[in-house]
Interface confidence: low
């Protein structure tokens, strides 16, 4: 299916930037791994690069305003042509859920005093209003809470005294435009201004004078100049050649505003100067190597001995790494495909170990699942032996690091009838549903 | 394009009444200052009545009392009714509307064809 083509994917906000244009396969646009496409107009955009996870996005709002409730936040696997860790299609969404608590306490509505004392009406002729309060606090509201209702009325009230009010010219408004900006045109061209007779308005009961004279002026425009002929376009110009060597490129087309030139004021002409058209090289763009992660640590050995385990004896491990993803004569992968380093082995050895403090709650797991809960745990942790920490293994070459490597057997006194982890589980609470964000905003 | 159509002129008795309407082919009636406007065989185009977009009306001194102008923004017209109608007031009678320009620099006014009316003595 045709896709819109862009020439640029934003990291920080998944977007897709500087339209290249629409019609063209998804093939066609990834020829070139730095740019990015979208299925319709608003859509998801993917990159054509290799697929791998985007940011984590902020967490939402906590799902309750008090006490404690839930949230969620999301990534995407975006790119194309393959897979992100953990055998995962583009466009998959992962949630995390984690507890959450906005303010501690819930409001507490309050209750109304009694009303107090009528105030004295608001006028002292014709018809006002009078006022009477009560005050928020029988009892007061708790933790931002307030007491329904107003802590003021009013209600009509009538002096039984009449008063006369005369009218008075409020002040001439501006002169409207001219009915006509230039000379030349079908009709005379006028201006008018207005007034009000609303300063005040003459009173009904007893009637008030009515203001005296016209509410409208009217005069003649002067010195106006000629109408403005509005300018117009000429042909357009030749194509320019494509400007780019492979993948897909704009050309462009130019014409001149020139076809009559704009006069006395008139309009420039209304559309484009340019415009362009999709360019197709048919060459693919050549794509550079990227480092695959590195590889686990080989065992800890030293030549010439069957075992160092749980022994002062320094020995050497190493790692590797793979270029993927070279094509079209792209850069190769820059650095080392091998890591060495020197180590003590500790694997399997028995070791005394000291209890953990307890970690953090760890996230809600499932989160989209039924029943999430979190949990957190006390571990069993080896004290390490106090080997030195660093070695001369050959003359000349100065001292090296030493790491611990291997996966040792700790030994702690049991703890509530564990002897190497103690977990603690709770449910969470007002668990928000997961949506697509991308189909929210359709 | 906007056009103003109008209608209801004609020969009338001096004393009697006449009722114009002017119909708008487009919906400028809610933001236009709607005008009547008349003009005798060799006079200047003069100023009858007057409505403005919030309601107000306004009146030559010469017509005061005898002519009201009216609107009805559903049907986008404007109506003039004349009674007590007196010889000197035979003119072509023009319905007008008009509104700022979009750059509030100029005015945009639509203008009706005009329509005779004659009171005989």
């Known amino acids: 299916d045709p896709v819109l083509c862009f020439t640029q994917y934003e990291e920080s906000s998944g977007k897709c930037k500087g339209l290249l244009g629409g019609g063209v396969s998804v093939e066609d646009c990834c020829l070139n791994t730095a740019f990015a496409y979208q299925k319709r107009s608003g859509g998801l955009c993917q990159p054509c690069r290799s697929p791998r996870w985007s940011l984590w996005s902020t967490w939402a709002p906590c799902s309750v305003t008090c006490s404690e409730g839930s949230q969620l936040r999301y990534r995407r696997c975006v790119g194309w042509n393959g897979q992100c860790s953990g055998k995962v299609a583009p466009g998959t969404l992962e949630w995390q859920l984690q507890a959450c608590e906005d303010q501690q306490c819930c409001p507490e509505m309050g209750g109304w005093s009694g009303w107090g004392p009528w105030e004295p009406c608001s006028v002292t002729c014709s018809k006002g209003t009078r006022t009477r309060r009560r005050a928020c606090n029988h009892p007061a509201p708790k933790c931002g809470g307030h007491c329904p209702g107003q802590a003021q009325e009013s209600e009509a009230c009538d002096t039984q005294q009449v008063c006369p009010t005369h009218g008075a010219w409020a002040t001439w408004g501006p002169w409207t435009p001219c009915s006509a900006s230039c000379h030349g045109g079908p009709h005379e061209p006028k201006e008018t201004r207005s007034r009000k007779c609303s300063a005040p308005e003459p009173s009904q009961k007893p009637p008030g004078k009515p203001c005296p004279g016209l509410a409208y002026e009217q005069r003649r425009c002067t010195g106006l100049p000629p109408c403005p002929v509005a300018g117009g376009w000429g042909p357009w110009g030749p194509v320019s050649p494509c400007p780019v060597t492979c993948g897909l490129g704009q050309t462009m087309e130019q014409r001149t505003c020139n076809h009559p030139v704009p006069q006395h004021g008139g309009p420039f002409c209304a559309g484009d100067a340019t415009r362009t058209h999709i360019c197709n090289t048919a060459v693919p763009c050549p794509v550079d190597g990227e480092w695959d992660s590195w590889g686990e640590w080989s065992p800890c050995i030293r030549r010439n001995m069957k075992s160092i385990s749980c022994q002062e004896i320094p020995g050497q491990q190493s790692r590797g790494r793979t270029c993927r993803g070279r094509k079209f004569d792209g850069h190769r992968c820059a650095g080392q495909q091998q890591d060495i380093r020197h180590c003590y082995s500790i694997q399997h050895c028995p070791l005394k170990g000291s209890w953990s403090e307890w970690s953090t709650w760890g996230l809600c797991m499932p989160p989209c699942g039924p029943n999430p809960t979190r949990a957190r745990q006390r571990l069993c942790t080896p004290l390490l032996p106090k080997y030195p920490p660093t070695v001369s293994m050959v003359e000349g070459q100065g001292e090296k690091n030493v790491t611990f490597w291997g996966r040792p057997l700790p030994r702690c006194e049991e703890l509530q009838g564990q002897k190497l982890v103690v977990e603690e589980k709770r449910p969470c609470l007002h668990v928000p549903a997961c949506k697509d964000p991308e189909e929210e905003e359709l | 394009q906007v056009h103003m159509v109008e209608s209801g002129g004609g020969l009338v008795q001096a004393g009697g009444s006449l009722r114009f309407s002017c119909a708008a082919s487009g919906n400028i009636f809610t933001i236009s200052t709607l005008d009547w406007y008349r003009q005798a065989p060799g006079e200047q185009r003069e100023l009858v009545a007057t409505l403005t977009p919030d309601g107000i009306t306004d009146y030559a001194g010469s017509v005061k009392g005898r002519f009201t102008i009216s609107r009805d923004n559903a049907k986008n017209t404007v109506y003039l009714q004349m009674n007590s109608l007196k010889p000197e007031d035979t003119a072509v009678y023009y319905c007008?509307?008009?509104?700022?320009?979009?750059?509030?620099?100029?005015?945009?006014?639509?203008w009706g064809q005009g329509t005779q009316v004659t009171v005989s003595g």
């Open positions: 007008n509307a008009w509104r700022y320009s979009d750059d509030y620099r100029g005015r945009v006014d639509y």
